[in-house]
């Protein structure tokens, strides 16, 4: 048994990193591997990591964690029974891909204005709240040729588009995504889109 | 109430042996780092050794390495000092003392919160 | 090893007026914000420590609110806004950041 790519490691800077690996051959992950880690501190023990399936040779492993601070290093052993396949670290403050924000709302009904709205995915409390910075993606169903990105680099998550720029009488979709500018992180993944309906017509003066 | 209760100490010669025991009760036993400290007479406070809630990890004193051994039984809820190789400069009053919480991913620390009363070790010829 | 260096070593008060130990480690015991791994242990005459003070500030259980720590990184004090009589001992702080868990000399704290 073989990895054949070695582990790389995500944090959500919350509760969870998320470790991929690719082994040399088809394997159950769950039953064959265990990732064992430790955070390098006083008296800390070592947990254990059981790895599901992602993709006929790929393992994925999601690591239970406390709030992360810069300081926290972790040893990581990915062992297959007795056999120790592999032995890294992993710093989850350099490692940082944010969790997607969810609650993606659509107000059709403010005058003339197309209100996006999306909740922060994490508490007050966490570093990252007051520097995540979003890009909410508009496309078309109707109109492939239609998608736009709007970067909403002010921490409020809300996001106004004056309806007079979207054609009338289609669908529109809309997603949202999140990164943290001062910690370096990747972008986050998607948020489940949302659909509405633009119904708005200009006034008969302006057509 | 939370309770540490020693035992073992003596009067032992130079090279000799001796197992320190301490008892916990009143708290979940296994779930916290233990840590021993000793004061010579007349002298202040030094750390001996430390050992995590499972026994997996284990720290000690530069002057006590390769002779003493910190072990625990946690279905006994106690914690061990096995002391080999006795020197004169081992006499001291040992206590046993409640450390961390080593369960959790990052330990929780309230400081070493509840001491036992110390059992007393005289290294003599 | 990190060093811990108390002062003074021995501190006369007068009952009703406060008292103050600083210590200095050698190197930081700043984990994390809010987590200076500094504690304070006062050990009566033929008594075990009993901990007074835990991660740099936090006052333990049963504590009588005239003990207060502060101070981050490198530098610590314990303050006492009233001695009492019952106050008398050796006090000790302790590094807990990583072992070996180093103790300062200790400070005698005597009624004048």
């Known amino acids: 048994m073989k990895v054949l790519q070695e582990p790389a490691c995500v944090s959500d800077y919350m509760s969870i990193s998320t470790c991929e690996w690719k082994m040399g051959g088809p394997t159950n992950c769950s039953a064959e591997l265990r990732l064992l880690y430790q955070l390098v501190f006083q008296s800390s023990e070592t947990h254990t990591c059981v790895p599901e399936n992602n993709g006929g040779v790929g393992c994925v492993c999601h690591l239970l964690m406390d709030d992360v601070v810069s300081m926290d290093n972790y040893t990581l052993d990915l062992w297959a029974g007795q056999q120790l396949l592999w032995k890294g670290s992993f710093k989850p403050s350099e490692h940082v891909k944010p969790r997607a924000p969810g609650n993606l709302t659509v107000h059709t009904n403010v005058s003339d204005t197309v209100l996006l709205t999306w909740s922060n995915p994490y508490p007050p409390d966490n570093y990252l709240y007051n520097d995540l910075t979003y890009a909410v993606n508009i496309w078309s169903e109707n109109d492939p040729a239609y998608s736009r990105i709007h970067n909403v680099t002010y921490l409020k998550p809300t996001l106004r588009i004056p309806a007079s720029t979207l054609k009338s009488g289609i669908s529109y979709r809309a997603r949202v995504r999140a990164w943290a500018q001062h910690y370096n992180t990747t972008w986050s993944e998607w948020s489940p889109s949302t659909k509405w309906y633009n119904s708005y017509r200009e006034p008969f003066e302006q057509r | 109430e939370v309770q540490l209760v020693e035992s073992g100490g003596g009067l032992e010669q130079p090279g000799g042996s001796l197992r320190l025991s301490c008892a916990g009760s009143g708290f979940t036993f296994r779930t916290y780092a233990m840590t021993w400290v000793r004061q010579a007479p007349g002298k202040g406070l030094e750390w001996v050794s430390s050992i995590s809630g499972d026994g997996s990890n284990t720290y000690y004193a530069d002057s006590v390495k390769g002779r003493f051994t910190i072990s625990r039984d946690n279905s006994k809820n106690t914690l061990y000092l096995q002391m080999n190789s006795l020197r004169a400069e081992d006499t001291a009053v040992y206590y046993c003392?409640?450390?961390?919480?080593?369960?959790?991913?990052?330990?929780?620390?309230?400081?070493?919160?509840?001491w036992g009363q110390g059992t007393t070790v005289t290294v003599s010829s | 090893d990190i060093v811990m260096t108390q002062s003074p070593l021995s501190l006369p008060v007068t009952p009703g007026e406060p008292a103050s130990i600083s210590c200095t480690a050698s190197q930081s015991l700043l984990y994390s914000i809010g987590y200076n791994y500094v504690d304070w242990y006062l050990q009566k005459s033929g008594q075990s420590p009993q901990l007074l003070i835990y991660?740099?500030?936090k006052r333990a259980s049963g504590v009588p609110d005239r003990f207060s720590g502060s101070g981050s990184g490198t530098d610590f004090t314990l303050k006492i806004s009233r001695v009492e009589a019952e106050d008398v001992g050796f006090y000790y702080c302790m590094q807990a950041l990583t072992t070996p868990y180093t103790f300062g000399q200790g400070t005698k704290l005597e009624i004048k």
């Open positions: 991660l740099g500030n």
């Open positions: 003392a409640k450390d961390r919480v080593s369960i959790t991913i990052r330990p929780r620390y309230y400081g070493l919160d509840v």
